[in-house]
């Protein structure tokens, strides 16, 4: 992975494109699209005022976190439409790329040395807890992917990108 | 730096349980999974589960479902392995390994524990 | 589960030979593949990650490739300290193989 790949727009927008067509094809699907049960994802809400105001290091903290808990929910998504007795051909094709799309930006953002700056504070149990939502339906997780990366991840990689550039 | 320390070398009969730890610094505990990994004797790697350090789910290999229990400590940055009705064929060096979120390559490893399993 | 098929299991080469180990995957797994290095008495090390991407630190001379079900690792010119143990794994499913490794030796 060539280590400023993810500084490309277009890299982020085609894993984007991806997460909005996931969206898409869920939306009105009630019958095949329940995960019937609640996932833990990241809250994808951000405030602003107070990113602008952390260090890189600390974004990184948060993207990675995000990142890391968005697999597994996704994964568990996974797992769960494995199990179940008739598993719904589209939604099967968009959860496996949504796997394939969160391991390839791990591999990108690891490039761009995000788990570098991700290092933890003096005392691990010190580090803010990432703030967490529950998803019940692939439609929220799908919609989860897609506002963590238009927003953290994509603020992430602005700022990471740009400071790599000086 | 990050680093793993394990628990130290363990003597068991057979029907015993063991309990390894792994200690892990240098990194947000939470941000990544613990997965273990044992080798017997001249053997081969297997697989033998994963943890979230975050939510506490786990994955088990089928073979060892029912046996084994995998849980941290968030508080001490701190993960555990159990391992239920011990055989001989259970003697093993046991490793624990950090894996990152769904992009399960181990890129730092516990220093192994032995776990010697004889009547 | 995905059954990773490593060969060959052992081999003697020169220092400066070029070395190739082979793993194949019972099933496609895209580039969802690891290569690990151990050492005797040693914890496995990481080498490559997804098929092709050189680990932080690891010498070039170290590398991998293939995608689906077929995968090459390469040592390009052999050196003493190489003499070791490497595994492939796979992680597209769980549970998560490893092949069964290559012991490496030198001649």
């Known amino acids: 992975a060539p280590p400023r790949l993810i500084c490309d727009s277009r890299v982020l927008e085609r894993y984007l494109l991806e997460a909005k067509e996931a969206e898409n094809i869920t939306t009105g699907c009630a019958e095949h699209c329940s995960l019937n049960e609640n996932i833990t994802v990241p809250d994808t809400k951000v405030n602003f005022y107070a990113w602008k105001r952390m260090e890189v290091g600390q974004q990184a903290v948060e993207v990675w976190q995000g990142l890391a808990l968005l697999s597994e929910a996704v994964l568990r998504g996974q797992a769960l439409l494995v199990n179940s007795s008739q598993p719904w051909e589209p939604l099967q094709l968009h959860v496996d790329k949504a796997v394939s799309g969160l391991r390839s930006l791990t591999t990108l953002l690891r490039a761009l040395g995000a788990q570098k700056e991700a290092i933890s504070p003096p005392d691990a149990a010190s580090a803010a807890p990432l703030r967490t939502i529950t998803a019940d339906t692939f439609r929220k997780l799908f919609r989860v992917y897609s506002n963590f990366l238009r927003g953290k991840l994509k603020l992430y990689t602005g700022e990471a990108c740009r400071t790599g550039d000086r | 730096q990050v680093q793993l320390v394990q628990s130290g070398a363990e003597v068991k009969k057979p029907g015993a349980s063991v309990k390894v730890s792994c200690k892990a610094s240098?990194?947000?505990?939470?941000?990544?999974?613990i997965n273990w990994v044992r080798q017997a004797p001249g053997q081969g790697l297997e697989w033998m589960g994963w943890l979230s350090a975050y939510s506490g789910n786990t994955n088990y290999a089928q073979k060892l479902q029912g046996r084994v229990t995998m849980t941290t400590d968030t508080s001490t940055s701190t993960a555990y392995m159990e391992l239920r009705s011990l055989r001989s064929d259970d003697t093993a060096v046991y490793y624990c390994?950090?894996?990152?979120?769904?992009?399960?390559?181990?890129?730092?490893w516990g220093q192994g524990t032995l776990v010697t399993v004889s009547s | 589960d995905i059954q990773m098929t490593q060969s060959p299991s052992s081999l003697s080469a020169s220092v400066g030979d070029r070395v190739t180990i082979t793993c194949q995957a019972s099933q496609d797994i895209s580039n969802f593949l690891n290569w690990y290095q151990q050492k005797p008495g040693k914890a496995p090390k990481l080498l490559i990650y997804d098929a092709s991407n050189l680990e932080t630190g690891v010498p070039s001379r170290f590398s991998g490739s293939g995608s689906g079900t077929d995968f090459t690792f390469t040592i390009s010119s052999l050196q003493p300290e190489d003499v070791a143990t490497y595994y492939c794994?796979?992680?597209?499913?769980?549970?998560?193989?490893f092949g069964g490794g290559t012991k490496v030796e030198i001649k």
């Open positions: 240098g990194y947000t505990f939470t941000t990544y999974g």
């Open positions: 794994q796979q992680y597209d499913n769980f549970p998560l193989t």
């Open positions: 390994a950090r894996g990152v979120g769904a992009s399960f390559y181990f890129d730092y």
